[in-house]
């Protein structure tokens, strides 16, 4: 099949006091090979500080996955979700508040 770029969505939720969990979801992409990772100041976080979901079919012939990490509240600007898929890449910031969701489709 032809390449379908992922839709990338970053959300945040309250964790323990002073911390938030940030989750980066990539969906509706093909083929299934993808790099999805959290970066701090542009540097990838170590594997032991991130949690990844499996790359799963979403029922439409495309795939979805996610990566999450916990960060200190107030340091959101230092963190971005980095995505690479089929030779294209994109960077996605943490939204500024709970109600803000960022959806980006990349070509």
């Amino acid at each position: 099949g032809s390449t379908v770029p992922p839709m990338v969505n970053v959300t945040r939720s309250e964790a323990s006091e002073g911390n938030i969990t940030v989750t980066c979801r990539a969906s509706s992409f093909y083929p299934r090979n993808i790099i999805l990772t959290w970066r701090q100041d542009g540097v990838s976080l170590s594997h032991d500080t991130q949690q990844w979901g499996d790359v799963l079919p979403d029922g439409n012939g495309t795939y979805q996955t996610w990566v999450a990490t916990r960060i200190c509240r107030g340091e959101e600007q230092r963190f971005t979700c980095y995505m690479e898929h089929s030779g294209n890449h994109s960077t996605h910031p943490v939204p500024s508040g709970n109600s803000h969701h960022h959806h980006h489709h990349h070509h």
Epitope: D41, V43, L45, T91
Partner: antibody, heavy 118, light 108 residues
Framework: EIQLVQSGAEVKKPGASVKVSCKPS????????IYWVRQAPGQGLEWIGY????????IYNQQFKDRATLTVDKSTSTAYLELSSLRSEDTAVYYC???????????WGQGTLVTVSS | EIVLTQSPATLSLSPGERATLSCSAS???????LHWYQQKPGQSPRLLIY???NLASGVPARFSGSGSGTDYTLTISSLEPEDFAVYYC?????????FGQGTKVEIK
Amino acid sequence: EIQLVQSGAEVKKPGASVKVSCKPSGYAFTSNNIYWVRQAPGQGLEWIGYIDPYIGRIIYNQQFKDRATLTVDKSTSTAYLELSSLRSEDTAVYYCSRSGERSNFDYWGQGTLVTVSS
Amino acid sequence: EIVLTQSPATLSLSPGERATLSCSASSSISSNYLHWYQQKPGQSPRLLIYRTSNLASGVPARFSGSGSGTDYTLTISSLEPEDFAVYYCQQGGSLPLTFGQGTKVEIK
């Protein structure tokens, strides 16, 4: 091969501004942050700030926030550092560097000497 | 601001000797955020060791790094002539990003 090529040496008067360019090659320009660091003669390294070329986000060392301006031109894959209100203490070699997969500074430009003298 | 203090300021050794360079942080930092750079006269810095103990590409195995918390060490097991340079530690755990003041390894 990854390279970062910087503009040439500059001599400026106190109070003037200087703009240093940095043109990386060998990788996708918007995939890595560009950092700026300076080194006064015979001294250590001092971080100025960084810019994410993809989203345009800039993080400054607060010490330079009022006088440093970081920009990128995605059409030419070039990053810029402009420093205003120059004083003699700003005489230094200014380096650009690329954020790495596992460290803040994995490739460096050759440096640009900025001399501030009346 | 995390202050990194390197010691000694200058290390005078002969080729073949072992060099031990220290980097002490004013606050504890994760080992994931401590890196070492080498700088020779008239040259740009070069990444040497990342995340405390991992050798950067092309760096010889005589270099090694260790440490945790506030105390980190760079070791050169047997100095080669090309190793005489200034070495900087750097932390990326908190802003502002900071470097140590450097240790100069000079020929005795």
